[in-house]
């Protein structure tokens, strides 16, 4: 059962599985949320009672019952793990810690204007884990605005110690603000030979990639395939880090393969989700359990149910024998990885999908589009919304995006003269404008925050955010879309479609179905020439046929411009202005989002 | 009806700047952009420039980057066109226009032309 | 730049004639072609946009064709009043350019 809140001077009996040192019990149990293995913690507060050695360790602990004996403890604060919660979880940590000196490998000393700064330049660069930052009270002159980063083997400080006048505080790179690039290319018959941090049994190249993504010191990885010569190298991932921060030497081998961890495109696609079903594979670990199970979907489900099974394998059942059920084989491991990796012996393995909940909900893969035609089917557009205005009548007055579960956005034009927000309602998982009816459920609008720079669409700034007043459940139907990477803006987006209720030329009325329409996108400086009237800046975006005849037009204004990438879908543009609807040689001019993300994830992230 | 009236011919010396006026009616000013057109005696149209009088924003022929410079003053209505540093052959007549499109078309008004001559 | 080289330089027709101006682009320009009609001492005059829609209040005798790179202005009936020069310009991409004109005289 999901327990959230924390335990006041309570310490958990037992149980140690290691012990690393936090800022606060809120960041204790979102380590250990991340960690394989743990399922509860005991955090140690600073305190006249305590043994300062002792202050700020995080105890992570494990369960056969899931849970532990409590003992009184002045300063200890215990909790549970997120592991066996639903809800969305992040390692996100925007908190500065002041007097707080987080201990770490020292790499990199430079002066910063500020703690904000020094963050930033954590964020960007590709050791840091986490910094700290001597402020310019700091009493030794020559230290005062010093910029520290550092790293540790855990990405946790190896020690923190009470120090005046300096903060500290994490890379802010799990929060998808790092400008890193996001490099997801895998590179067939590659051996990246650099130092290894660490080993682990991984069944392709993909989960290897994902595992290195979500271990702190990772930067890139090789991984032998199960052909590779070396019997005993099969299956083996090895993950890798350098100075340089980039593999030194890349060496051709054939059945290797080698890539870059995904940490700055980690909230773009899923890397901690491996749904994938390995067929005649065994996945060997410790085993927790053998359950009876009619398929590896359902094996696959009670592992994920099973709050300690980190991975499983089937073996389908032999004729009629056992109702025709076959062995579900629920395993762990210390690091959430096999122990060894077998072919040929007729099982079905894979993951539990409990960790997919770590994962950006926009990474779930939506239901096979519809090719041709320009009416939608339900579901096809999961993220689309239509906001309407209940004044004076009410009406469909833009699209809208859903990108997380209670924000939608659009585009700033959208609310020249609309006075509040009262008089906005936002429906989702619509297909037909004349499915809205009195009794249609809707989500009020709380807020509508319009950038503070916007003065018209042609302008640029074209971007609003609306902060409803419920949450969104979702569903097939309504769910986010993405927001593309700041390491991802050099991206060549090839799969792009424009949706809307909009008009479908020029003086014609709101289309009752969802209309969609794959457009290509046009470089600024080809945009540019169209519009010589207008500065078309970095912050736009340009999308149209050269023919026209397709495009955006009056209606579908605020709504996204979507484009597929490795699978997963990104909000690339917000439908913002152009000249007429489908004119030959005019694209149509749309928000680039990925010059937003920063403005995005502050308004929506703010407390 | 939508009129571009402008301002009267000039007489300068090689060297010297000269500022046309181009004031607008009969429509919304920040509506449409106004560009700015050249003809020597004699000879074709030439692009100088244009200016969106809702943003200020000003797009340059490359051969008059450096020379012209185009601005406009929305509370009158009025769009100018200075150019610096004349020569013999900046003699001719100079038209601004307004465009048919809101973001750069056909020019469906112009002005009467401004005739500058530059003669030492 | 976009170069458009216009044919002829002059035409002399007779009144009541069909008179044919050509225009060349040095480049495509899909539809984004406009004509222009300039008397003694007047500006232009906007005949024609987007290769062959007319302009509000131009007589019907006037018409436009064409597409990619050659495009033709038609008078189909030559009237007294049609004597003057007349320019096309293309507007697919900054900065816009006009035909060296070709002038229009009755035989």
């Known amino acids: 059962e999901c327990v959230t809140q924390l335990l006041k001077d309570t310490c958990f009996e037992g149980g140690d599985i290691t012990t690393v040192f936090t800022p606060s019990a809120k960041y204790c149990q979102v380590v250990c949320t991340y960690h394989p293995r743990c399922l509860l913690f005991t955090f140690t507060a600073e305190s006249p009672s305590e043994d300062p050695t002792r202050w700020f360790t995080c105890v992570l602990k494990d369960s056969v019952t899931e849970t532990l004996p409590r003992v009184n403890r002045t300063a200890a604060i215990s909790g549970y793990s997120f592991k066996q919660c639903s809800h969305q979880i992040s390692a996100c940590n925007k908190d500065i810690y002041v007097d707080l000196d987080m201990k770490g490998i020292n790499y990199n000393s430079s002066v910063a204007k500020s703690a904000q700064e020094c963050q930033e330049r954590c964020t960007d660069d590709v050791h840091c884990h986490f910094f700290t930052y001597a402020t310019r009270q700091f009493p030794s002159l020559e230290h005062r605005n010093i910029c520290l980063l550092k790293h540790t083997q855990t990405g946790t400080p190896t020690r923190i110690t009470k120090l005046d006048k300096v903060v500290s505080g994490f890379s802010l790179k799990s929060c998808a603000l790092s400008n890193l690039a996001c490099i997801r290319d895998i590179f067939p018959n590659t051996v990246f030979a650099d130092s290894n941090i660490d080993s682990v049994m991984a069944p392709d190249a993909f989960v290897c990639g994902r595992i290195c993504t979500h271990h702190p010191g990772c930067l890139f990885f090789t991984f032998f395939s199960q052909e590779w010569p070396k019997e005993s190298q099969r299956n083996l991932c090895l993950l890798k880090t350098s100075e340089s921060g980039l593999p030194s030497t890349r060496i051709k081998k054939s059945k290797a393969l080698s890539g870059f961890s995904l940490q700055s495109c980690r909230h773009s696609i899923p890397v901690f989700c491996h749904s994938s079903f390995y067929h005649d594979t065994d996945f060997l670990g410790e085993e927790l359990d053998i359950v009876a199970a009619k398929s590896h979907e359902a094996c696959q489900k009670l592992c994920t149910n099973a709050v300690r099974c980190q991975f499983f394998t089937y073996t389908p059942a032999q004729a009629s024998c056992n109702e025709g059920k076959g062995k579900c084989y629920l395993k762990l491991s210390s690091n959430g990885s096999p122990t060894k990796i077998l072919h040929g012996r007729g099982g079905i393995s894979g993951y539990t999908l409990r960790l997919c909940k770590m994962d950006n909900e926009c990474t779930t893969k939506i239901k096979p589009r519809i090719v041709g035609g320009t009416a939608s089917v339900r579901g096809e557009w999961p993220w689309q919304v239509t906001l309407h205005t209940t004044s004076p009548t009410q009406r469909h007055l833009c699209g809208g995006s859903i990108i997380g579960n209670q924000w939608i956005l659009t585009a700033a034009h959208c609310f020249y003269g609309v006075e509040s927000p009262k008089i906005l309602r936002v429906y989702s998982g619509i297909l037909n404008q004349s499915e809205i009816k009195e009794d249609t459920s809707f989500f009020g609008v709380q807020e509508i925050i319009i950038h503070d720079q916007y003065k018209m669409a042609e302008s640029g700034y074209d971007i609003a955010l609306l902060k409803l007043e419920t949450t969104v459940n979702y569903t097939d139907s309504q769910r986010p879309i993405c927001l593309p990477s700041k390491g991802d803006r050099n991206v060549i987006y090839t799969d792009c479609w424009v949706t809307g209720w909009g008009y479908r030329k020029l003086r014609d009325k709101i289309q009752n179905t969802l209309q969609k329409a794959k457009i290509p996108l046009v470089t600024n400086e080809e945009c540019q020439k169209r519009y010589r009237g207008h500065k078309i800046t970095h912050k736009m975006i340009c999308a149209g046929y050269r023919e026209g005849g397709k495009d955006a037009c009056k209606g579908d204004s605020g709504g996204p411009l979507s484009c597929k990438h490795n699978e997963v879908w990104h909000l690339v543009g917000i439908t913002s202005w152009g000249e007429g609807c489908a004119q030959r040689e005019r694209p149509g001019v749309y928000t680039n989002v990925v010059e937003y993300v920063d403005w995005i994830l502050e308004k929506t992230q703010a407390v | 009806q939508v009129q571009l009236v402008q301002s009267g011919a000039e007489v300068k010396k090689p060297g010297a700047s000269v500022k046309v006026s181009c004031k607008a009616s009969?429509?919304?000013?920040?509506?449409?952009?106004i560009e700015w057109v050249r003809q020597a005696p004699g000879q074709g149209l030439e692009w100088i420039g244009v200016?969106?009088?809702?943003?200020?924003?000003?797009n340059y022929n490359e051969n008059f980057k450096d020379r012209a410079t185009l601005t406009a003053d929305t509370s009158i209505s009025t769009a100018y066109m200075e150019l610096s540093r004349l020569r013999s052959d900046d003699t001719a007549v100079y038209f601004c226009?307004?465009?048919?499109?809101?973001?750069?078309?056909?020019?469906?008004?112009w002005g009467q032309g401004t005739t500058v001559t530059v003669s030492s | 730049d976009i170069v458009m080289t216009q044919s002829p330089d002059s035409l002399a027709v007779s009144l009541g004639e069909r008179a044919t101006i050509n225009c060349k682009a040095s480049?495509?320009?899909?539809?984004?072609v406009a004509w222009y009609q300039q008397k003694p001492g007047q500006p232009p005059k906007l005949l024609i946009y987007?290769?062959?829609n007319r302009y509000t209040g131009v007589p019907d005798r006037f018409s436009g064709s064409g597409s990619g790179t050659d495009f033709t202005l038609t008078i189909s009936s030559l009237q007294a009043e049609d004597v003057a020069v007349y320019f096309c310009?293309?507007?697919?991409?900054?900065?816009?350019?006009f035909g060296g004109g070709t002038k229009l005289e009755i035989k």
């Open positions: 226009a307004r465009t048919y499109g809101k973001y750069g078309g056909a020019m469906d008004f």
């Open positions: 009969g429509y919304t000013f920040t509506n449409y952009l």
């Open positions: 200016i969106n009088p809702g943003s200020g924003y000003t």
């Open positions: 987007y290769i062959s």
């Open positions: 310009q293309q507007d697919y991409s900054s900065p816009p350019t």
């Open positions: 480049q495509s320009v899909s539809n984004d």
